[in-house]
């Protein structure tokens, strides 16, 4: 039997054992989070699958993910949302210690999809494990990109109080308007609910004592936020290692000095 022709994309294919991974993550999440125990993981997988299976992987819309978003509805308490840009690992290390703060990946839908890749093929029920569209080289409306855009928008829309964002001070653009934070989340914070955005700029070098809150891209962020009438604050985190240590042990004498 001749193998059926398959579209060749520039990006890596669907993560191996994708359905099993999503289902297992869902079960684990609902066991650990009592408020989500009512969630039926099989329905979640069916909704996830329904968003991209049999669809042309360059023509996925936010609408495709709405059934999944509905099933994964979750609220974060006011003042407890942590956004991040280009510094995922530290943000996740932080929320693992500061358990009452939440990144998108601490929520069910973000947890399910974190670090995974997936796509299907038009008119077949198969998952494409060989290749998936690359955002730059192929198309932006691919299953993975649209998923993160959809859930990031929703995460930002539901945030309230003081919202925090962790930014990577080692990058040339500390605030990048083309990042998910810069292109989606910033614009979907609701001024009626969000009083302020507080940026934590994480320094890379041990000897870096510059005030990165004065960086031009941070001022650009403030400019965007100010038009939406949301207050903006910024803090330098000069020593991320010490920062995490002090979150774990706030009573430590060294934590009374600056971080």
């Amino acid at each position: 039997v001749l193998p059926r022709w398959r579209q060749q994309w520039s990006g890596s294919g669907t993560t191996s054992r994708f359905p099993e991974t999503v289902l297992a993550r869902c079960v684990k999440y609902t066991e650990v989070h009592p408020e989500m125990r009512h969630v039926d993981c099989q329905s979640v997988w069916d909704a996830f699958k329904g968003a991209f299976i049999s669809k042309y992987p360059c023509n996925i819309t936010e609408e495709d993910y709405q059934p999944l978003v509905k099933l994964g509805t979750q609220t974060v308490p006011c003042n407890k949302t942590l956004l991040w840009s280009r510094i995922k690992d530290l943000a996740h290390q932080f929320t693992q210690v500061q358990r009452d703060m939440f990144t998108l990946e601490d929520m069910l839908l973000g947890y399910l999809a974190d670090d995974l890749t997936w796509c299907g093929e038009f008119n077949t029920f198969e998952i494409n494990y060989q290749s998936c569209p690359d955002w730059r080289k192929d198309c932006s409306n691919n299953p993975v990109s649209v998923f993160w855009k959809t859930v990031s928008r929703r995460f930002a829309e539901t945030a309230c109080g003081v919202v925090h964002v962790m930014l990577n001070g080692s990058r040339s653009k500390i605030f990048d308007k083309n990042s998910t934070f810069g292109s989606v989340e910033v614009h979907n914070l609701q001024p009626e609910k969000v009083q302020a955005l507080e940026a934590w700029v994480i320094h890379g070098g041990r000897e870096d004592s510059r005030d990165l809150c004065q960086d031009p891209t941070i001022k650009e962020l403030e400019s965007i936020i100010s038009k939406r009438n949301i207050r903006f604050f910024c803090k330098n985190i000069y020593r991320p290692d010490k920062f995490l240590q002090c979150v774990k042990n706030p009573e430590d004498s060294s934590c009374l000095s600056g971080i």
Epitope: K177, S223, S226, R228, N229
Partner: antibody
Framework: EVQLLESGGGLVQPGGSLRLSCAAS????????MNWVRQAPGKGLEWVSS????????YYADSVKGRFTISRDNSKNTLYLQMNNLRAEDTAVYYC???????????WGHGTTVTVSS | QSVLTQPPSASGTPGQRVTISCSGS????????VNWYQQLPGTAPKLLIY??QRPSGVPDRFSGSKSGTSASLAISGLQSEDEADYYC???????????FGGGTKLTVL
């Protein structure tokens, strides 16, 4: 004294080009988003274009998109507006104005007049 | 046709209180900063109100308010030097643009 001073206006034929400049003084130009706003004779204010602090992104009114280009040189404290393929309806006084976070356009120049006519 | 809607004219006698309205939508006035500008005859516009507050140097006779998708400018104790054009403006999230009202010509009778 905080000041914005526009120059480069004049009479130009339809289809022609002009480059407006706006020299800033008395404030840290590189800390502000900048704008061009115009006012046709006897009409109201119309926003034309904005440029971010670093110049890395720009916005345009639909009426000028593809014809006008906003730029800035932070080392020279100067804002520019390159206007190509000018039309009669572009005839206006062109003002440059800064955007101060949480305030709005708080410093305006006196304006430079652009007349597009054959 | 302006995105923000203002009455074309308003008038009052000296000492009176006058209000100018500005109507928009959720993507501009509804969620964003609202400004009011005063333009005296033959001069450049001047920032009068930002987010219902006055910049320094603007008399407290001028005040701004906002409710839902509408904003208004109130001038109490009207004076002859208040005769000018008044414009509301806001950033519009949908258009990625500053939008202005058509302007209101205030006449002091």
């Amino acid at each position: 004294e905080v000041q914005l001073l526009e120059s480069g206006g004049g009479l130009v034929q339809p289809g022609g080009s002009l480059r407006l400049s706006c020299a800033a003084s008395g404030f840290t130009f590189s800390d502000y988003e900048m704008n061009w706003v115009r006012q046709a004779p006897g009409k109201g204010l119309e926003w034309v274009s904005s440029i971010s602090i670093t110049g890395s992104w720009t916005y345009y009114a639909d009426s000028v998109k593809g014809r006008f280009t906003i730029s800035r040189d932070n080392s020279k404290n100067t804002l520019y507006l390159q206007m190509n393929n000018l039309r009669a309806e572009d005839t206006a006084v062109y003002y440059c104005a800064n955007y101060k976070s949480y305030y709005g356009m708080d410093v305006w120049g006196h304006g430079t007049t652009v007349t597009v006519s054959s | 046709q302006s995105v923000l809607t203002q009455p074309p004219s308003a008038s009052g006698t000296p000492g009176q209180r006058v209000t100018i309205s500005c109507s928009g939508s959720r993507s501009n006035i509804g969620t964003n900063l609202v400004n009011w500008y005063q333009q005296l005859p033959g001069t450049a516009p001047k920032l009068l109100i930002y987010n219902v507050q006055r910049p320094s140097g603007v008399p407290d006779r001028f005040s701004g308010s906002k409710s839902g998708t509408s904003a208004s400018l109130a001038i109490s104790g009207l004076q002859s030097e208040d005769e000018a054009d008044y414009y509301c403006a806001a950033w519009d999230d949908s258009l990625n643009a500053w939008v202005f009202g058509g302007g209101t010509k205030l006449t002091v009778l």
